[in-house]
C-alpha cells in the first residue's frame, strides 16, 4: 500500500539533488583554492540536516546554522553585487569582472542555485514529487528559508560601495517583496556601507528614459537614505554594450554612455 504523501503546489526536489550538491561542492573547492579546506561531505551532512525529517513548512534559519558555519568564506566586502529579477546578466557580469561577487559566486549560493529541495516530517526521505510553493503553501519552506538566510548574511558582510543590478523592464523595478527588497536592503550595515549604487538595466533598444526617476527607485532611495546609507543610480541603456565594455574597457566606443 503506497504511503499517503503530502501534495504541495510547487515542483519537487531537483532530481539527483544529493549528488548535485556534493559534486558542486567538490568542483567549487577545486576552483577556489581558499576553500580547499572545506570538507564537502560535512557540507552535505549539514545541508541534509537542515531539512530532512522536518516538516517542509516549519523550517527555521537556525536549521541552516551548521551549513552557514561550514560554508562561511572570505569575500571582499567592497566587491559585492546584489541583483533583483536579473540574475543572468548579474552572473555574466561577475564572470567577466572576476573581482566582483554575487551570492551565487560564493560556495553556498553556488551549491543551491536553481535547485529545489524538501523533505517530509518524521521520515528520512527526500520529496521528489512536490515541495511547498512560497505563495500557495508556506513561506517557511526549505528553499525560501535557505535563500533568506544566505542573503541576509551576504548583505551583512558588505561594505563601502555596494552595487545592485535591477531589471528596468519590470513594472516594479524595485520590488519590496523581492529577496533584495525584503532581506538584503534591510541587512546592509550603515556603519560599514557608505553607498548603495543601483544599476537599472534597460530592456528595449530605443528606451532612452531615465529609469532612475521611476517611483519604485525613489522608494528604494528613501528606504536606503533612512538607513543612513547614500544612494546613487545609473541607467544601463545597452546591457550588451555594457558587458562588452567590461570585457574590453579600452574600446573607443566605451567612453560614451552605455
Amino acid at each position: 500500500v503506497p504511503r499517503w504523501r503530502q501534495q504541495w503546489s510547487g515542483p519537487g526536489t531537483t532530481k539527483r539533488f544529493p549528488e548535485t550538491v556534493l559534486a558542486r561542492c567538490v568542483k567549487y573547492t577545486e576552483i577556489h583554492p581558499e576553500m580547499r579546506h572545506v570538507d564537502c561531505q560535512s557540507v552535505w551532512d549539514a545541508f541534509k540536516g537542515a531539512f530532512i525529517s522536518k516538516h517542509p513548512c516549519n523550517i527555521t534559519e537556525e536549521d541552516y546554522q551548521p551549513l552557514m558555519k561550514l560554508g562561511t568564506q572570505t569575500v571582499p566586502c567592497n566587491k559585492i553585487l546584489l541583483w533583483s529579477r536579473i540574475k543572468d546578466l548579474a552572473h555574466q557580469f561577475t564572470q567577466v569582472q572576476r573581482d566582483m561577487f554575487t551570492l551565487e559566486d560564493t560556495l553556498l549560493g553556488y551549491l543551491a542555485d536553481d535547485l529545489t529541495w524538501c523533505g517530509e516530517f518524521n521520515t528520512s526521505k527526500i520529496n521528489y514529487q512536490s515541495c511547498p510553493d512560497w505563495r500557495k503553501d508556506c513561506s517557511n519552506n526549505p528553499v525560501s528559508v535557505f535563500w533568506k538566510t544566505v542573503s541576509r548574511r551576504f548583505a551583512e558582510a558588505a561594505c563601502d560601495v555596494v552595487h545592485v543590478m535591477l531589471n528596468g523592464s519590470r513594472s516594479k523595478i524595485f520590488d519590496k517583496n523581492s529577496t533584495f527588497g525584503s532581506v538584503e536592503v534591510h541587512n546592509l550595515q550603515p556603519e560599514k556601507v557608505q553607498t548603495l549604487e543601483a544599476w537599472v538595466i534597460h530592456g528595449g533598444r530605443e528606451d532612452s528614459r531615465d529609469l532612475c526617476q521611476d517611483p519604485t527607485i525613489k522608494e528604494l532611495e528613501s528606504i536606503i537614505s533612512k538607513r543612513n546609507i547614500q544612494f546613487s543610480c545609473k541607467n544601463i541603456y545597452r546591457p550588451d554594450k555594457f558587458l562588452q565594455c567590461v570585457k574590453n574597457p579600452e574600446d573607443s566606443s566605451c567612453t560614451s554612455e552605455i
Epitope: E34, G49, E62, P66, Q73, T74, E156
Partner: antibody, heavy 117, light 107 residues
C-alpha cells in the same frame, strides 16, 4: 603544525576591562572560525562566541553579549577578546580554539584572568 | 539552549577495561558532536569530531558513535594516560554547549 598562542595571565580590578590575544600559526588564519571558551573550577566549559577572521563575522552566546567583544587582525593572524565591566564572576581561564566541523580542533594554552580588588 | 547531559559524572575503572561515556542532547543535533579530553592542569584536546571521526593523532582505542540525541564515547583497553575529565559539545545551534564532564579515575 597548527598553534594558538595566547597572551599571559591578567590580574585586574573589578569594573575595569581586559583584552587578551590569540596568535595563530601553521594554517590560513582567514579560513577558520576562532572559538572562545571560558572555564571556571566547578563550572565546566562555557562557549562565549566565535569570529570568522576572513569576513569579520561574529556570533555570541547571549549570556556574553555586552561582556565580550571579539575582533581579529588578519595582518598579524591574531584574534582578540575584550571583557568589560569585570566582576569576580569573570575570574576564569579563557581559551581560544580553532573551529573544525563545528567542533574545536586545536586549543590555545589559555589566559588566566583574576579579578580582585 | 540545547542541554547536553553527560553520564556518568565520575567513573572508576581498571587498566585494560573498556569504558563508555554517554551524552544526551535535549534536541536533535544530527552528527554535530565533539568529544574532548582534559587532563588535570592541562588544556582540553579534541578526540572525536562529527560524532565518530577520530581527530589527528588520537589513539584508535578511542571511538565515538551516535546521531540525533544519543552519543557515546568508548575507550577500549584503558591506559594510565587516559586519566582525565571528558566533555561532549554540540555544534548544531548557538550557543554551543558542553556536557558537565565525566571524571575518569583508575581503580
Amino acid at each position: 603544525q597548527v598553534q594558538l598562542q595566547q597572551s599571559g595571565a591578567e590580574l585586574v580590578r573589578p569594573g575595569t576591562s581586559v583584552k587578551m590575544s590569540c596568535k595563530a600559526a601553521g594554517y590560513t588564519f582567514t579560513n577558520h572560525w576562532i572559538e572562545w571558551v571560558k572555564q571556571r573550577p566547578g563550572h565546566g566549559l562555557e562557549w562565549i562566541g566565535d569570529i570568522f577572521p576572513g569576513g569579520g563575522y561574529t556570533d555570541y552566546n547571549e549570556k556574553f553579549k555586552g561582556k565580550a567583544t571579539l575582533t581579529a587582525d588578519t595582518s598579524s593572524s591574531t584574534a582578540y577578546m575584550q571583557l568589560s565591566s569585570l566582576t569576580s564572576e569573570d575570574s576564569a581561564i579563557y581559551y581560544c580554539a580553532r573551529g573544525r566541523d563545528l567542533a574545536m580542533d586545536y586549543w590555545g594554552q589559555g589566559t588566566s584572568v583574576t579579578v580582585s580588588s | 539552549d540545547i542541554q547536553m547531559n553527560q553520564s556518568p559524572s565520575s567513573l572508576s575503572a581498571s587498566l585494560g577495561d573498556t569504558i563508555t561515556i554517554t551524552c544526551h542532547a535535549s534536541q536533535n543535533i544530527n552528527v554535530w558532536l565533539g568529544w574532548y579530553q582534559q587532563k588535570p592542569g592541562n588544556i582540553p584536546k579534541l578526540l572525536i569530531y562529527k560524532a565518530s571521526n577520530l581527530h589527528t593523532g588520537v589513539p584508535s582505542r578511542f571511538s565515538g558513535s551516535g546521531s540525533g540525541t544519543g552519543f557515546t564515547l568508548t575507550i577500549s583497553s584503558l591506559q594510565p594516560e587516559d586519566i582525565a575529565t571528558y566533555y561532549c559539545q554540540q555544534g548544531q545551534s548557538y550557543p554551543y554547549t558542553f556536557g558537565g564532564g565525566t571524571k575518569l579515575e583508575i581503580k
